[in-house]
Each structure stands twice: as C-alpha cells, then as structure tokens.
Amino acid sequence: QAGPLPKPTLWAEPGSVISWGNSVTIWCQGTLEAREYRLDKEESPAPWDRQNPLEPKNKARFSIPSMTEDYAGRYRCYYRSPVGWSQPSDPLELVMTGAYSKPTLSALPSPLVTSGKSVTLLCQSRSPMDTFLLIKERAAHPLLHLRSEHGAQQHQAEFPMSPVTSVHGGTYRCFSSHGFSHYLLSHPSDPLELIVSGSLEGPRPSPTRSVSTAAGPEDQPLMPTGSVPHSGLRRHWE
C-alpha cells in the first residue's frame, strides 16, 4: 500500500502582496506524474481553477492578469496523478493592496529619537477602519496588527516602541483594513524614516524582531513594549 501522494509546493510571483490591477502568477509544483493541477480558495463554493501541467508536468501556472478583490484570499493546490489526488499544499495568502485610500504615518514626538527613549508611530486613516498594519522595509514579515474590539472602528492606531534601540531605525509604512477581509489592505502610507541617534544601547535584538526588544522565538513578530494602544484597539499579531 503506497502512502499518500506528497503535497505540492505553492507560491506566487512576483510575491504574495499585490497592488490592485497588477498581474500575479501562482505556481503549483507537484511531481512528474501529475496529470492535472487544481487551485482551491478557502471558503469558496467550488474549485477555483484547474490547469494542465506544463512540461515536464511537475508544475502548473495559474495566471491573474489583473489583481482585484475577487482574487485576494487563502489558497491551496493539489495535483492528480494516476493514483488520485495529492495532499493539499501549505496555504498561500494572497493579499491585495489598494483597496482603500492610504493612511498617514507619523512619529510622536518626532521621527528623530534618541536610543533608550520612547517613540510612538501613529497610523491615521481618513475613514474609520478596524485593522491597522505596520511594516518595516526589508523585515521578514508584517510587524504588528492592531485590530479593534467588537468591530468598533477607529481613525487611528498607535504603535509604541520603548526603549528604542538602533535596530528600530529604518523605513516604515502602514496599511489600514476592514475586518471582514484581512486580505484587502489600503494603499500604503507614505514612508516614514525613523532615525535613532545616541549611544544608550541595550542588548541588540534579532533584526527580524525589529519592533521589539523583548525576547521571543526567532522570526516571530512581537508586541512592542510600553503604553496601551489607542482606545478600543487590541494588539493582534499573526
């Protein structure tokens, strides 16, 4: 009795965060025995797409010529071989930016901060939103979500950082979103350059934990230390 077929690999090019209107290609790579590939979107009422494999049959291409809200979501793929369907791939989360107008990102009291002091990054949206996301350029993942309680919508979210070290320096952007789909994000805010000066250095955290000086598992986004976020919002990280 042969074991289950190995699961395929699923990825997106040029990446999994795509601006509205841009093209994206989803690839599913299985085995040379694959006869057909299938892409399923989470909670959709039917198979999303099916494709014949490209030679030499070990992968298939699913093209999205123009990214829209329809395509944002969580995907898995499968392949069919002569003995049946494979296990599902690990999920791919396809996020669309540009669903809402861009928020404004600012630093309080100033984007120029002395090491060891505190700074708060403030993300403000024109219309009330219930999720705010802070990212740092070249970070491995989004740094932090702030999501409102009970669907209460806010115009802003605060991301406090304390104490600041040199590793907090860099370029930040924020996004806003509505809770009904965290796969739909606003346009990015204009970039904010956070400049850390002075020599009051504590222990250097791992670069992948760029918002926090707290210890934690490698490659995990951690909560910033310090004050409570803007009223009505709770910290939430993926």
Epitope: K41, P45, A46, D49, F180, S181
Partner: antibody, heavy 122, light 110 residues
Amino acid sequence: QVQLVESGGGVVQPGRSLRLSCAASGFTFSNYGIHWVRQAPGKGLEWVAVIWFDGNNKYYADSVKGRFTISRDNSKNTLYLQMNSLRAEDTAVYYCARDVITLVRGVPFDYWGQGTLVTVSS
Amino acid sequence: DAVVTQESALTTSPGETVTVTCRSSTGAVTTSNYANWVQEKPDHLFTGLIGGINNRAPGVPARFSGSLIGDKAALTITGAQTEDEAIYFCALWYSNHWVFGGGTKLTVLG
C-alpha cells in the same frame, strides 16, 4: 446538449425515506459539481446541497443537515439525494442544477433539470 | 441564519435599464459571497445568468451584467427586452452554504 433529468419523486409519509436521482448527459459529468435545489409550492428557491466534481466536498443547507445525503456515481453520470426522516416541510419540487468546473471559468447553477415532485404527507 | 432580500417586483419598458438588487441580512455583500443570478421563465425553466468570478454564462446576452453596488449585489439589464420578463433569483454563498433570495418578478411592459 446539456441535459439533467431528475427522477424518484413521489408521495411519502413523514419519517420515511426517499432517494432521488439525477441523470446527466451532454457534458463531462466528472468535471462538474452538481446541486440539489428545491421549490415548495408557491414559494421561492431553497438551496439543498452541493457535491464537488470528485465527490470529496459536500455542503448542505442547515434545514437538511443530518437527514439528507448527496452522492454521485461518475461512472454512471448520476447524482443522488438520499432523503431520510422526511417532514411535511420537505414537500417541494426538487431540481438538480449544474455547478461550475471552476469559479474563474463558469457560472454556478447554469443548467437545471425539469424537477421531480416530492410530497410528504400522512 | 442569513436572509437574502430582493425587490418582490419591478416594472420596466423595452429599451430601459433596470437593476435588481440583492441584500444580505449579515451585512454588506462582498466578493466572498460570489453573487449568482438565476432566471426563471414560465413552466419552471431555470437558467444561470451570472456568477462565479463575474462570469456571464454562454449564450446570455451582454445586456445582463452583475456588480456590487454599495452594500448590495446587483443585476443590471441595459436595454431590457420583452423576453426578459421573468423571475430573477440571486444566490449568495456563506462560507459553506448557498442562500437564495425570494426572487424579483420583472415585468417588461410591451
């Protein structure tokens, strides 16, 4: 041309069982999901259940969950609905309707059968 | 359970544009509801018109289009014809089940 033909309806007492069939032709049955949809006399449509092309995904309306079972035999191009513990409120014309091959390339509920009447009465 | 609401009846004239809407009791209709439109002609003849990812079924005239307008799904007939007189049902998907609206009886005054 695409054809869906339902059969198996009739008069049945409350609490009893009935099995409906839907014979498909004119398309590659094994590529498509299929729905059961019902319409009570003088009422609108009520979705009952769907089964995906390979039979591995099945979804049901809350009103029939645990009582009805959807299944298919791709070698016979036939869809089934096993209805147990029937109630008076299950009285309706039952239709099978074709689903999509894939959402990016089709329209759910595109072709329908002519329906089969199920009457649940003592 | 979700309830899907449509206008019970609409009347239009040939050549006019008419819009049938579909509202969800759970909030705004979104792309995740995969709004679907089905036409019922006399003698219980049903045909799927629009659904999936904004697809129009083969053979369905281009005057039929689907969209999201505000918090509702909409079926627009641009330049209605007398043969468009029918009952139109919308169906919305809720993660693991479909729910049909009550149907809209469209009368096209000839």
